[in-house]
Amino acid sequence: FERTRSLQDPCSNCPAGTFCDNNRNQICSPCPPNSFSSAGGQRTCDICRQCKGVFRTRKECSSTSNAECDCTPGFHCLGAGCSMCEQDCKQGQELTKKGCKDCCFGTFNDQKRGICRPWTNCSLDGKSVLVNGTKERDVVCGPSPADLSPGASSVTPPAPAREPGHSPQ
């Protein structure tokens, strides 16, 4: 089948990194600079993505694969293939239309991206709060109150928040 297909379509012999050049009698020509073809049998090469402005190059374009971008420090990727860069906030904050805002009481954000989330409700699981939550940290749940020995205090003050905390991914 492969042999039959290649007799019918000479372009199927062109490997990744080349294109089937109609202007040159369907000869396999290398992709021009700043373009690539990631599969064989292509009739054109795709233009390489350029990482400009707030984007920076994570992986250079090659003749067989597109460039990959990530974001400059202070920003993080959003969307498939890092299609957008969004501003980082500090731990204990979330990004709103008006910029970075502190988490409201009862919520936290332990990352430089994302939203403030409610502290975990330990009682959902029949547990008690072992370590109190802060703007930067969720509570830590502990054993159920019944599991604690008499006279034992269940709640520990929160651990001091420290940078860098949860790094942006």
Epitope: L124, V131, C141, G165, Q169
Partner: antibody, heavy 119, light 107 residues
Framework: QVQLVQSGAEVKKPGASVKVSCKAS????????INWVRQAPGQGLEWAGN????????NYNQKFKDKATITADKSTSTAYMELSSLRSEDTAVYYC????????????WGQGTTVTVSS | DIQMTQSPSSLSASVGDRVTITCRPS??????LNWYQQKPDKTVKLLIY???RLRSGVPSRFSGSGSGTDFTFTISSLQPEDIATYFC?????????FGQGTKLEIK
Amino acid sequence: QVQLVQSGAEVKKPGASVKVSCKASGYTFTSYWINWVRQAPGQGLEWAGNIYPSDSYTNYNQKFKDKATITADKSTSTAYMELSSLRSEDTAVYYCTRDYGSAYSMSTWGQGTTVTVSS
Amino acid sequence: DIQMTQSPSSLSASVGDRVTITCRPSQDISNYLNWYQQKPDKTVKLLIYYTSRLRSGVPSRFSGSGSGTDFTFTISSLQPEDIATYFCQQGDTLPYTFGQGTKLEIK
């Protein structure tokens, strides 16, 4: 009781993809993080990423960013990790885990799914 | 990423012995340190969370201590059923990272 039941072993060819499932029961699925952890043969444990099923917010280990896609289906209380462009180095046992109440520890582990990549 | 240096990588001890494993993160992780047990059948179980808190149902011979960059896991009196590999894990900073494991064998 809290349980995570994973899909069965898979054998795949290099370049293929595989989707491992993790069905949760015995608790409110949307209220706890689900993590995915990899263990290559004879090696230690490696955190791949996690998902908060309530809003499908995900975190990834940079090492797995181009390899894994983590999703969750609230209607069936099932989390998934899809691995793409498989290579022999992806041969491993993949575990799903649930947090203990806050994301900082993993209290319940699935039985593990063995993924073998071989030509 | 935070590197977790766990030692020893393996150890052999007798029933009734006191066994100690250490875990040293490459940076301060406060008390966000957990210990897991992986049995030979590959099942994994959380034993200790937040440095020293014993998971409900886990025998009291298991304990943990430490803070910051120096942590210890102890089995006060080794039992035959404790044959397993033990891992530490930091939950302070993404990506979460594990120690390389300590394989425990009975003499």
